[in-house]
């Protein structure tokens, strides 16, 4: 399976809420052998390989945020920690991913990245990961509301493949 | 901070099962996040991974040993093991428990290893 | 399976030295590969993640590179300390390693 970042830049007004959002693509297994965590972290743009580094979001790892499902199930961050910080990541069963983040500062500007691990029991496992643009504005030049610019079709580093 | 303890008889007489068990301390077995995993390293040479299991009870084997490879886990206990059957000298290893972060990947805790030998 | 093929087997160099350390891939693996340093008689010990990411607390001359099948594993300056055999490892899939590289002080 690939997973896929539908939008690759998010230009959002400051104390705007914004939802990223990956996409799980190809044959994706929904029987009950299978399980998928995921989560999303902060990273930079490294010459070689994006998403490389990993970066807590407003203070919260990739292990805070994760999420695991079954294959036929959806999920979402209920815990109390992630809300306080304004976050939540879910999952439904059509294969997107999000993350949400309420009332954005300037400080939430950056690369952010998704990661999927499908694990098939008795089987195999695979991980891939797709990154994504967040840029908060103030003043005069920012928009009234989230403006999202598709990925292009070529963009390599936005698609990883299993 | 987590401990993993491997134990179990050094020496197993060939065509005869090796049964070695990790005892785990400082964390639950029972973490949804990790998979538990045997890894051994004949004498002076590489490292093979022998197989994982999760959380749940299911298992990932190295499809050169899977059909010797047993990895049952006891929760009560905080405890997974390993058997391995038919041993032959070719078998003769240190064994190593460890821990892998399902996602972060690498195995980032290890038992110290225990010798076995396989020999009549 | 996914191979990994490390090279060299063994090396010797001075203290100070630059030592560069390579695995290769059967597949690509995207970044999902990780180092670790181990002594005689001892576990192995996690050094890098995610091909470049260095585990806390490891020291900051060691590093990683690379991505997709060609990753390389460098230490900066070689101190006596650092005599051990390394090993990669991917987890792109069902985890393999590499054959692993003896570093000798000369």
């Known amino acids: 399976f690939k997973v896929a970042t539908p939008y690759s830049l998010y230009v959002c007004p400051e104390g705007q809420n914004v939802t990223l959002t990956c996409r799980l693509l190809g044959p994706v297994d929904k029987g009950h052998d299978v399980t998928f965590y995921k989560t999303w972290y902060r990273s930079s743009r490294g010459e070689v390989q994006t998403c490389s580094e990993r970066r807590p979001i407003r203070n919260l790892t990739f292990q805070d945020l994760h999420l695991h499902h079954g294959g036929h199930q959806a999920a979402n961050t209920s815990h109390d920690l992630a809300q306080r910080h304004g976050l939540e990541s879910a999952s439904d069963h059509h294969g997107n991913f999000s993350i949400t983040m309420r009332n954005l500062t300037l400080l939430d500007s950056g690369l952010y990245c998704c990661l999927v691990v499908e694990i098939r029991h008795h089987h195999s496992e695979h991980r891939v990961h797709g990154a994504m643009e967040l840029q908060v504005q103030t003043g005069k030049d920012a928009p009234s509301n989230c403006v999202v610019y598709p990925s292009s079709s070529q963009d390599s580093e936005n698609i990883t493949a299993a | 901070q987590l401990q993993l303890q491997e134990s179990g008889p050094g020496l197993v007489k060939p065509s005869e099962t090796l049964s070695l068990t990790c005892i785990v301390s400082?964390?639950?077995?029972?973490?949804?996040?990790?998979?538990w995993g045997w890894i051994r390293q004949p004498p002076g040479k590489g490292l093979e991974w022998i197989g994982s299991i999760f959380y749940s009870g299911n298992t990932h084997y190295n499809p050169s040993l899977k059909s010797r490879v047993t990895i049952p886990v006891d929760t009560s206990k905080n405890q997974f093991s390993l058997k391995l059957s038919s041993v032959t000298a070719a078998d003769s290893a240190v064994y190593y428990c460890?821990?892998?972060?399902?996602?972060?990947?690498?195995?980032?805790?290890w038992g110290q290893g225990t010798l076995v030998t396989v020999s009549s | 399976d996914i191979q990994m093929t490390q090279s060299p087997s063994s090396l010797s160099a001075s203290v100070g030295d630059r030592v560069t350390i390579t695995c290769q891939a059967s597949q690509h693996i995207t970044n999902y590969l990780t180092w670790y340093q181990q002594k005689p008689g001892n576990a192995p010990k996690l050094l890098i993640y995610d091909a470049s990411n260095l585990e806390t607390g490891v020291p900051s001359r060691f590093s990683g590179s690379g991505s997709g099948t060609d990753f390389t594993f460098t230490i900066n300056s070689l101190q006596p300390e650092d005599v051990a055999t390394y090993f990669c490892?991917?987890?792109?899939?069902?985890?393999?390693f590499g054959g692993g590289t003896k570093v000798e002080i000369k």
């Open positions: 490892q991917q987890y792109d899939n069902l985890p393999t």
């Open positions: 460890a821990r892998r972060d399902i996602l972060t990947g690498p195995f980032d805790y």
């Open positions: 400082g964390g639950s077995i029972s973490s949804s996040g990790y998979y």
